[in-house]
Amino acid sequence: YFGKLESKLSVIRNLNDQVLFIDQGNRPLFEDMTDSDCRDNAPRTIFIISMYKDSQPRGMAVTISVKCEKISTLSCENKIISFKEMNPPDNIKDTKSDIIFFQRSVPGHDNKMQFESSSYEGYFLACEKERDLFKLILKKEDELGDRSIMFTVQNED
């Protein structure tokens, strides 16, 4: 069971300091941006991280949403990353959800975060370079210290 607590506005970056944003086609990607670029591209660079209390504490349970014309929430249903047109619900009556991730700090690096899927244990949000693009994917953690699954989260409130 997950019960919604408060939400915060955040900028999410990979360890190359590239900013996560949602393009016009609702596609998540990371790009080099100055602080000015980041502001100019809002709200596509601003993510609503909603925190949830968890009946089985396993880390900080969160959903990740973005509000452009409508609110879209990150899902990893079927291990496929997509933004679904939906508000983060107040309650989720299950121990797993395709939209709930466990946000945890990397041991020894309090400012670095990982987001593990609650539906697929051991699968994390990751940044992957494909051609000249840096994409958001879901990735099974294969080795310790994998930088592709580490992010920084900067609160904008």
Partner: antibody, heavy 121, light 108 residues
């Protein structure tokens, strides 16, 4: 370059077995589903099944369940489609295709070049 | 399973003219529809996803519309390279995806 490269043309006799392959490169192959699609001569596209190479989870179309086996070897970034006993009606072009994630979710965003399988006595 | 029906089976249009291809789903699929182009001897290529969004490098003369059960692919001014077979595909209840039977776009 992001690509799927399939094995070459096959000519087999009815009753023979066959395993064709699809090797992914230029992306994290273990993080995307691979689908297999059949196209019989002069006909349309038919989905056969999917495999997630990261953990070899498979999903089959009811039409093809029990008729073919889909597998993967993640150490070689390769997916396979196999038959234990071919029939003349299996003659077709077989495509593998990547299922988009993040970008183009749930669609086939990258396709292999196809493997032509001919089954004839 | 969701049945996708494309019409017409063949469409003859002159270069420079507008082409309109239709795709109908047997039940509502929201906007979970893709269009692919296939040329002879080639693999299909993704053109449109979520019913109306063009994939990378797809020219602006291609546009998709519709939601629910009725969908349209429009090519505003046909170029010679656009003559091909076009397939719609639903992914509303993935993994049970289905394709339409295709529309052949030929030169008039």
């Amino acid at each position: 370059e992001v690509q799927l490269v399939q094995s070459g043309t096959e000519v087999k006799k009815p009753g023979e077995s066959l395993k064709i392959s699809c090797k992914g490169s230029g992306y994290t192959v273990t993080s995307y589903w691979i689908g297999w699609v059949r196209q019989m001569p002069g006909k349309g596209l038919e989905w056969m099944g999917f495999i997630y190479p990261g953990d070899s989870e498979t999903r089959y179309s009811p039409t093809f369940q029990g008729q073919v086996t889909i597998s993967a070897d993640k150490s070689f970034n390769t997916a396979f489609l196999q038959w234990s006993s071919l029939k003349a009606s299996d003659t077709a072009m077989y495509y593998c295709a990547r299922v988009g994630s993040g970008w183009y979710p749930y669609t086939f965003d990258i396709w292999g070049q196809g493997t032509m399988v001919t089954v004839s006595s | 399973e969701i049945v996708m029906t494309q019409s017409p089976a063949t469409l003859s249009v002159s270069p420079g003219e507008r082409a309109t291809l239709s795709c109908r789903a047997s039940e509502s699929i929201s906007s979970n529809l893709a269009w692919y182009q296939q040329k002879p001897g080639q693999a299909p290529r993704l053109f449109i996803y979520t019913a109306s969004t063009r994939a990378t490098d797809i020219p602006a003369r291609f546009s998709g519309s519709g939601s629910g059960t009725e969908f349209t692919l429009t090519i505003s001014s046909l170029q010679s390279e656009d003559f091909a077979v076009y397939y719609c595909q639903q992914y509303n209840n993935w993994p049970s995806i289905t394709f339409g039977q295709g529309t052949r776009l030929e030169i008039k």
